[in-house]
């Protein structure tokens, strides 16, 4: 084994290095000392380190480690943060487009139903946005509310335009009749199926991205234990105490130390791998009725067809509703 | 392509969300994200090695520091000696992950379970529960991009019409069209506290 170079007789080099870490030289001995109070950089002979220096080295080592960890995860963190933001905005744009398409459909085909239809459509798409962002709203309830709200307007404006405007009494009856008589056929059910499937997947996709950010943030800001700090100090700084300023840690030694320091973090690995593969599986399935862009941007046409269905069955519906809601209508005509 | 009748749209404006290709769609962007994420699949298991390779480590030098003394880089002592009579590395490993790490592992387990239950099994294009009470699902041909509703050859085909990153925004409200939302690129500004 080659003999170690003689320690710096004056600790001058050590002082100048340490000064970069800690301005003020009062902690660095003038000449090598026995160092019997040292707890980490245990000396084999005289040393240029003091207990205070050792503590500062430990602090610096842990800080170095935290910075290295942050720089390691920077690209990954940015990738997920940027995509989470882009997708969230893109989904908002899809919802806004879908709302505008639906409003335009009403304006062009059923002008007599506006502005009430605009209001109900607006409320529906607001709920869609809130649901995507994690709000505790039931999709079936959203769709039911849309059709419950639309039907009284369709009935009073399209099917039975002779009714007076102040149709509050009959409105409640019409809302009930809408479900009991399956006024829109199976269109509400079709829309429920498509919207709930596509929004569930969209919502979990965004949740997963946001959790990805949380995972990186958690490991990014880990505080390393004192034991780890001591190991890092021994690896990176104890050589300074012997005046070995330019020497670097052995590669294998570094790996052993890092595995020790990061044993807890590495436990995430299994679940992180599973996370990425599960997210890939979800994304592969995000098409057709599992793709909110596809479903929401086509919603206006399904709603249009549902109204056409009502019109095709208008004769039978008007008769049945006339009987069912007769009491409400009589009250109004008085 | 999707059927969006022209008379539906009053205003046509260019919508840009980020600086990316014109033909990019939400689904292509999702796939691109997954491909990039997959390059980070070993991120956590590779961390120790990554940190060693990005901190001062003896590579070309004959001699290296093993925590106690200067040794030859390829000697047995290079990895072992520095650990003798030091605090026990095994002990350090046995302590288990920090509470925050355990918490995040639990959250990952939960989201993984959710992702698995939400994933569409291969081969199941549309749920057959659309068959009930008159609506029928049918098959979407493999050659089709997307389909909606209950049709086979012609469910509503939408080629992810919202080219969400550089696309015509068919907004009725002129003010509704978002402008450029450029993301800042990360700055390489970490301060290193190493001194050799």
């Amino acid at each position: 084994q080659p003999p170690p170079p003689p320690p710096d007789a004056t600790c001058h080099q050590v002082r100048s290095f340490f000064q970069r870490l800690q301005p003020g030289l009062k902690w660095v001995p003038e000449t090598p000392v026995p160092g019997s109070d040292l707890q980490v950089c245990l000396p084999k002979g005289p040393t240029c380190c003091s207990r205070k220096m050792e503590e500062k080295y430990q602090l610096t080592a842990r800080l170095n480690m935290e910075q290295l960890l942050q720089s390691a995860s920077m690209e990954l963190k940015f990738l997920i943060i940027q995509n989470a933001a882009v997708f969230q905005e893109a989904f908002e744009i899809v919802v806004r487009h879908a709302k505008n398409y639906t409003n335009a459909m009403f304006k062009n085909n059923y002008p007599s139903l506006t502005p009430q239809a605009f209001e109900f459509v607006g409320e529906f798409f607001t709920d869609v946005s809130l649901y995507i962002l994690g709000s505790d709203i039931n999709v079936d309830d959203m769709v039911n509310e849309l059709f419950d709200s639309l039907f009284p307007v369709i009935y009073t404006q399209l099917m039975n335009p002779g009714l007076p405007d102040s149709a509050l009494d009959i409105n409640e009856c019409l809302r009930g009749a809408r479900r009991d008589l399956k006024v829109f056929g199976n269109f509400p059910k079709l829309i429920m199926t498509q919207v709930s499937k596509s929004l569930q997947v969209t919502r979990i996709f965004l949740q997963a991205l946001n959790l990805g950010i949380e995972v990186i943030n958690t490991t990014d800001h880990l505080k390393f234990s004192k034991d780890c700090g001591r190991m890092l100090t021994r690896m990176w700084y104890c050589s300074y105490c012997q005046g070995l300023m330019m020497v670097k840690p052995c590669g294998g030694y570094c790996n052993v130390v890092m595995q020790g320091c990061m044993a807890g973090v590495v436990e995430i690995d299994k679940y992180w791998r599973e996370y990425i593969l599960s997210l890939e599986e979800l994304v592969n399935g995000m098409y057709r009725i599992y793709d909110m862009e596809n479903v929401l941007l086509g919603l206006f046409s399904t709603i249009h067809d549902s109204i056409q269905y009502v019109q095709k069955n208008a004769g039978k519906l008007t008769t049945t509703i006339g009987k069912l809601c007769a009491h409400s209508q009589q009250r109004q005509y008085r | 392509s999707a059927y969006y009748p022209e008379d539906l749209f009053i205003d046509k404006k260019v919508l840009k969300v980020a600086h990316v290709e014109h033909e990019e769609t939400l689904s292509s962007r999702r796939r691109e994200l997954i491909q990039k994420l997959k390059s980070f699949i070993s991120f956590y298991s590779a961390l120790p090695g990554y940190i060693c390779s990005h901190s001062p480590v003896a590579e070309n030098d004959t001699l290296c520091w093993n925590g106690q003394e200067l040794v030859e880089r390829y000697s047995q002592k290079a990895a072992r000696n520095g650990m003798k009579n030091q605090f026990n590395l095994h002990e350090l490993k046995m302590k288990g992950p920090e509470p925050v790490v355990s918490q995040i592992i639990d959250k990952l387990k939960h989201i993984n379970q959710l992702l698995r239950t939400m994933s569409v099994p291969k081969g199941r294009v549309l749920d057959k529960n659309l068959d009930e009470e008159g609506f029928e699902s049918g098959d979407c041909g493999d050659d089709e991009d997307e389909c909606i509703g209950g049709s086979g050859d012609g469910m509503m085909k939408v080629k992810n019409q919202l080219r969400f990153l550089a696309e015509l925004a068919y907004d009725l409200d002129v003010d509704d069209v978002p402008g450029n939302n450029q993301q800042a690129t990360p700055k390489d500004n970490e301060i290193s506290t190493f001194h050799n």
């Epitope: 056409q308 095709k312 004769g315 | 012609g154």
Partner: antibody, heavy 119, light 107 residues
Framework: QVQLQQSGTDLARPGASVKLSCKAS????????ISWVKQRTGQGLEWIGE????????YYNEKFTGKATLTADKSSSTAYMELRSLTSEDSAVYFC????????????WGQGTALTVSS | DIQMTQSPASLSASVGETVTITCRAS??????LTWYQQKQGKSPQLLVY???TLAEGVPSRFSGSGSGTQFSLKINSLQPEDFGTYYC?????????FGTGTKLDLK
């Protein structure tokens, strides 16, 4: 002028499936529903169901749910009807017909497709 | 489902004659009734809808009447091209159903 062109005569084995087509021209395909009607030899007409080409949503006569699947392809202005698990009872002439406005009045009909189910 | 019954099932008449075909609905369908004509080996053709409105291009010798459950189609001064089978159909709601048919042939 409005035309509905149906696929030609079809012969199928019992248990098999068959897909009939109806190509529309002369009007905006997505604006009107397409219905399918069955007529057995020497018998009356039966409404099978309709497809709303705009959204691709089908609606069925309960009697034909599970037997017929209606689809539409907007790009080619074509409506399709698939009949599955064929039996001799399915031997008939099948017509496609265009809706006249928002009602079950059929103003234009295809020429019909004769389907024979025989082993 | 609403049942539609036509009478007579068949009818023989000569060119120039006037004939009336009737259709009865199993429940009140108001005026939601359509009449079609079908010739041998051909597809049906729309004649009358909403019980009495003549479809475009249909000669004025055809006329529809009735409401509720009883309807009729009257053909004045029969022409050679008028022979065939006539079907009534309600369009009161889902599912639309057709009558049993009335075959009109040359005497």
């Amino acid at each position: 002028q409005v035309q509905l062109q149906q696929s030609g005569t079809d012969l199928a084995r019992p248990g098999a499936s068959v897909k009939l087509s109806c190509k529309a021209s002369g009007y905006t395909f997505t604006s009107f529903g397409i219905s399918w009607v069955k007529q057995r030899t020497g018998q009356g007409l039966e409404w099978i169901g309709e497809i709303y080409p705009r959204s691709g949503s089908p609606y069925y006569n309960e009697k034909f749910t599970g037997k017929a699947t209606l689809t539409a392809d907007k790009s080619s202005s074509t409506a399709y009807m698939e009949l599955r698990s064929l039996t001799s009872e399915d031997s008939a002439v099948y017509f496609c017909a265009k809706d006249f406005g928002s009602s079950y009045v059929f103003d234009y009909w295809g020429q019909g497709t004769a389907l024979t189910v025989s082993s | 489902d609403i049942q539609m019954t036509q009478s007579p099932a068949s009818l023989s008449a000569s060119v120039g004659e006037t004939v009336t075909i009737t259709c009865r609905a199993s429940e009140n369908i108001y005026s939601y009734l359509t009449w079609y004509q079908q010739k041998q080996g051909k597809s049906p053709q729309l004649l009358v809808y909403n019980a009495k409105t003549l479809a475009e291009g249909v000669p004025s010798r055809f006329s529809g009447s009735g409401s509720g459950t009883q309807f009729s189609l009257k053909i004045n001064s029969l022409q050679p091209e008028d022979f065939g089978t006539y079907y009534c159909q309600h369009h009161y709601g889902t599912p639309p159903t057709f009558g049993t048919g009335t075959k009109l042939d040359l005497k």
